[in-house]
């Protein structure tokens, strides 16, 4: 019988008492085969973290800073359940740390040196740890003691709870630095008052502070937020302009064998029976013998943290950077304006080899990081392990939802000013063999399908979006008799046609021979009835243009396109017979890397782009013998985006809407995780 006990860790007598009450009340409402609670008492949260790591306990609820400690080796814990605040309809699991300024003050984030600062309190998250952690490498050396470095960075501050004797500048704006509400500039409202009164130039608070202190929109409009990219935004645009997004209070468990499903089952049932306004005799979110025992008193309920989300992703790049800077205190030698090498994310070993060759030829401007799937690459870019990669539009959507931004677009047509003119897009098509003359768009049910990969534009999002509108369900593996759609569940009929061996079968990378445009076309040639690809795929792999044995004798005339009106047309008539226009592939990165990725990639394409004529002896960035490694092989240049610099603007309203509609069919664990952070 599986052990269905969750050992909860308590850090005080009062917590242990509440835990025992929690245990007893759960016993009274849950059947004997359901989850149960046991209580383990430890002296501190750090002791609880160690106990969970050592399998002496299973769960504890932690503030963000401790979630970071819990994640570090050797603890390796992960977030599994989040407390939420506000309403069930609009649950808030995160708050945003922001830098508020007066509208007419005219400076940016990178011009804070010499300004006057207002903090909620020394050592507090939004008011100190996050802003000072992010500014850490700009502080004057020596950076220890930290208070002295901060005092020398700003021209004056109010940092309640600081030592006014040793660091008088930190108390300059609030004599005495009192550590309670007796100090008018203490806490969130106090720090905002410090700015409002004109004592300080910037207040480090949370996003709700300004709304709680200024009910009137006209008053709020006198203030702005400083963004990390050295721009400003209105105070209600905090989701796009903050220092960090911080989880409020989170249950953590072991990463391996951590009982996360059991913990969720327990807490979900607990909130049903003992949540807000549920029971008089025991209340989960109430602490008669103290404050915030086991859970925050202000919590309204629990939400399950998506399984794909590790602590780094949950805490977010900015928060992790800030806390790591404060804890480790390491900065690059003298910070310069020069760009660091761009860490390119390569999928599996074929891309890695091409990336390595690029790295060697770039003489250190490009470094390479490997991942097995596109989603793993996106996650690595999010957390700073990698910086950039080029993505199909479907993944630009996921990357955008995860906070990444497009920087340059692949262009596929030769033109005089290629780099200045991003193209409208390419065509997504459905290709069939000419010999299968009875096959049309209207009778694809039961046929064998070939897709570039799940989540990609021409191979999945567009055809499956159109199909969904027709069949009104997501069971595409039942619609087609079998197929190859790399990235599908291994036991799905949409992996049946794939050719990868062993663990590589149906993997969404080049280890699966039917992956990508060329792979999907090969699948049609060898096994399938229809392939969903781009309009250039057939000409690029016929007429001897692809020397591989399977392709070298193919003739374009032996293939036709399916049109949405039920007719068929020759391959060259794609402009009048396609499924939709698809946005070109684009390079994505984190916002903080945008300028450097743009600069280095433009240098690199001038050295190794389409202007290189002999690829047999020279490195060519946009060539890989039809394998589309790192970039599509038909890329002519990487073009500036001009004002299309967000994923929504880049992909266009129509495509974003189409992918949004298909979201209910999404199997993307990363998309689920990212929409948890930003619904």
């Amino acid at each position: 019988v599986p052990d269905k006990t969750v050992r909860w860790c308590a850090v005080s007598e009062h917590e242990a008492t509440k835990c025992q009450s929690f245990r007893d009340h759960m016993k009274s409402v849950i059947p004997s085969d359901g989850p149960s609670v046991a209580c383990v008492k430890k002296a501190s949260y750090l002791d609880c973290i160690r106990a969970i790591a050592a399998n002496e306990a299973d769960a504890v609820t932690l503030d963000a800073g401790l979630v970071y400690d819990a994640y570090l080796a050797p603890n390796n814990l992960k977030p599994v359940v989040a407390e939420f605040y506000g309403s069930k309809e609009d649950p808030q699991t995160f708050y945003y740390a922001v830098a508020v300024v007066k509208k007419d003050s005219g400076f940016q984030m990178n011009q804070l040196r010499g300004k006057k600062s207002c903090h909620t309190g020394l050592g507090r998250s939004a008011g100190w740890n996050i802003p000072i952690g992010l500014l850490y490498c700009d502080l004057p050396e020596p950076r220890k003691p930290l208070e002295k470095a901060v005092a020398n960075f700003f021209s004056g501050s109010c940092a309640p709870c600081a030592d006014g004797t040793d660091f008088p500048q930190l108390c300059q704006l609030c004599p005495g630095c009192g550590c309670s509400t007796l100090n008018q500039y203490f806490g969130y409202s106090g720090a905002f008052k410090c700015l409002k009164d004109g004592a300080g130039d910037v207040a480090f608070v949370k996003h709700s502070t300004i709304f709680e202190n200024l009910a009137n929109k006209a008053d709020r409009d006198q203030y702005e937020l400083l963004c990390l990219d050295n721009t400003r935004k209105p105070v209600d645009e905090y989701k796009d302009c903050h220092l960090a997004q911080v989880p409020s209070h989170t249950v953590v468990a072991r990463s391996m064998g951590g009982k996360e499903d059991l913990i969720w089952e327990l807490l979900n049932q607990a909130q049903e029976h003992f949540g807000k306004d549920k029971s008089k005799e025991f209340q989960l979110f109430s602490s008669p013998h103290g404050k915030d025992l086991l859970f925050k008193d202000s919590a309204h309920g629990f939400l399950k943290v998506p399984p794909r989300m590790d602590a780094k992703m949950y805490l977010g790049y900015e928060y992790v950077t800030a806390i790591r800077n404060l804890r480790e205190g390491t900065c690059p030698e003298a910070p310069t304006d020069e760009c660091k090498p761009v860490k390119w994310c390569a999928l599996s070993h074929h891309e890695r080899l091409k990336c390595d060759e690029w790295s060697v030829n770039s003489v250190g401007k490009i470094e390479c990081v490997s991942a097995e799937t596109t989603e793993d690459c996106i996650a690595k870019i999010m957390n700073g392990e990698a910086d950039a990669m080029s993505l199909d539009g479907g993944f630009v959507y996921i990357a955008g939802k995860c906070g990444l931004v497009p920087v340059l677009a692949e262009n596929y047509n030769k033109s005089d000013n290629c780099e200045d003119t991003p193209e409208a897009g390419y065509f997504a098509i459905a290709v069939v063999k000419k010999s299968a003359s009875d096959l049309t768009w209207d009778n694809l049910k039961g046929k064998k399908s070939c897709h570039t990969a799940v989540g990609r534009t021409a191979g999945w999002n567009i055809p499956m979006g159109l199909l969904y509108n027709k069949i009104n369900h997501c069971r595409f593996d039942e619609f087609f008799s079998e197929g190859c759609a790399p990235g599908s569940k291994k036991d799905s009929s949409l992996c049946k046609l794939c050719m990868g061996s062993g663990l590589n079968l149906c993997e969404p990378n080049n280890k699966e021979g039917y992956y990508g445009y060329t792979g999907a076309f090969r699948c049609l040639v060898e096994k399938g009835d229809v392939a969903f690809v781009k309009h250039q795929t057939v000409p690029q792999n016929t007429g001897g243009k692809n020397p591989d044995p399977w392709a070298k004798n193919l003739n374009e005339k032996d293939y036709e396109l399916l049109c949405l009106d039920g007719t068929r047309k020759p391959v060259e008539e794609y402009a009048n017979c396609h499924l939709a226009r698809a946005p070109n592939h684009a390079v994505v990165t984190r916002k903080d890397k945008e300028a450097c990725v743009h600069k280095i990639l433009r240098q690199q394409q001038h050295l190794f782009g389409s202007n290189v004529t002999d690829c047999s002896g020279n490195f060519c960035l946009f060539r890989s013998e039809t394998k589309d490694l790192l970039f599509r092989d038909d890329t002519v240049c990487l073009a500036k985006l001009h004002d299309r610099n967000t994923y929504e603007k880049y992909l266009g309203e129509e495509y974003v809407k189409a992918v949004g509609n298909l979201r209910k069919c999404s199997t993307s664990s990363l998309l689920e995780a990212c929409t948890f952070r930003r619904p």
Partner: nanobody, 117 residues
């Protein structure tokens, strides 16, 4: 197809030196980017150092200042001079000319380097 043969490996004490060489048959050598890779037991193969046709070099951080890559186009040979060797340099070392262009997963036998006291 270009054949690449690595040699020069062996057992050496920490702090010692070795010089690996990679001999290529075929004329592609002088125009290709060349590189040394290594693979330790249970680990992924990793790029150690590379050299372009014009002689520009690039090294992984952990070997910078200790290893030197060079090539002699007249002899169709590439070298890796390894000084101040450490136990973590223990691996099978392979050379590649990238001429197979990433797709035909061909690697030579490699040469074993063991750093141990």
């Amino acid at each position: 197809e270009v054949q690449l043969v690595e040699c020069g490996g062996g057992l050496v004490q920490p702090g010692g030196s070795l010089r690996l060489s990679c001999a290529a048959s075929g004329s592609i050598f002088s125009i290709a980017t060349m590189a040394w890779y290594r693979q330790a037991p249970g680990k992924q193969r990793e790029l150690v150092a590379g050299i372009t046709r014009s002689g520009s070099t690039n090294y992984r951080d952990s070997v910078k200042g200790r290893f030197t890559i060079s090539r002699d186009n007249a002899k169709n040979t590439m070298y890796l001079q390894m000084n101040s060797l450490k136990p973590e340099d223990t691996a099978v070392y392979y050379c590649t000319d990238y001429s197979s262009r990433y797709y035909h997963d061909y690697w030579g036998q490699g040469t074993q380097v063991t750093v141990s006291s």
